[in-house]
Interface confidence: low
């Protein structure tokens, strides 16, 4: 059924648990999936007393919850781990919490880094 308007080929990658999982800590991830399946980017993070702690970022396989989302917006009210997904290259660089029940929108800017490419 096609890849959709905002085709995703690459995402920002991050893994807070990189030491244990034996991966790079951060960089760029090339997304690979089955033909005719859509690809997305995602971000997950915690908000500990106002301190934003990234958990993971990367590619996310075909998920209707992510369709046609150009921005990475978490909508759950007050989870322990926030999650958002989106379509479009590097769309998970910035991520936002906008609860469905209303309330202030909070956008998180990533710190400047020199990412490495993950293959």
């Amino acid at each position: 059924s096609g890849r959709g308007e905002a085709e995703t080929r690459e995402c920002i990658y991050y893994n807070a648990n990189w030491e244990l999982e034996r991966t790079n800590q951060s960089g760029l991830e090339r997304c690979e999936g089955e033909q005719d399946k859509r690809l997305h980017c995602y971000a997950s993070w915690r908000n500990s007393s106002g301190t934003i702690e990234l958990v993971k970022k990367g590619c996310w396989l075909d998920d209707f919850n992510c369709y046609d989302r150009q921005e990475c917006v978490a909508t759950e009210e007050n989870p322990q781990v926030y999650f958002c997904c989106c379509e479009g290259n590097f769309c998970n660089e910035r991520f936002t919490h906008l609860p469905e029940a209303g309330g202030p929108e909070v956008t998180y800017e990533p710190p400047p880094t020199a990412p490495t490419l993950l293959t």
Epitope: L20, S48, E53
Partner: antibody, heavy 117, light 107 residues
Amino acid sequence: MQLVQSGGGLVQPGRSLGLSCTASGFTFGDYAMSWVRQAPGKGLEWVGFIRSKAYGGTTEYAASVKGRLTISRDDSKSIAYLQMNSLRAEDTAVYYCARGHYGMDVWGQGTTVTVSS
Amino acid sequence: DIQMTQSPSSLSASVGDRVTITCRASQNISNFLNWYQQKPGKAPKLLIYSASRLQRGVPSRFSGSGSGTDFTLTISSLQPEDFATYYCQQSYSTPYTFGQGTKLEIK
């Protein structure tokens, strides 16, 4: 990769005691550092952790120790500290430091703290 | 706080047996679940992290599974050095919490 603990011993209720955890063999500043304790004959109890400076060096504590125990770190010396104030009999335990907080993969040898008059 | 409940609390088994220990969280913790082994007088040792990932240096007879609230640690063929106490621990939400432990004894 090694964590070597020091401090501990016998202390009276209400008094203070400090524990140290000296790291070697890895880049200490990149890691969160955790403390876990084990009362005699009991299971493991999470005490708290301190994040790396990249995450602000902020701390999290168990409710049972909040306000009395303080975790700090000195990245230049590769040492994590646990300062214990207003000690109670129920704080008697073996205290362990450990690397990381999502999963604690390197542990110190443990040090015994006995709170008794 | 999230409660972690292990079962059984103790278990007798023989060398070569297949052993399963379960851990249940009081709420969804995704895969933020670790398993530790502890022998008397020693520090705990990380066996499994992220519910199913084997820590480097840990024998492949150990495996972990589960997600959400129900988790399992399996030892496929018990060896003499495996007799110890095993703990699960969630690192999803602070305060992090451990299960009460499962003591694995020789039958």
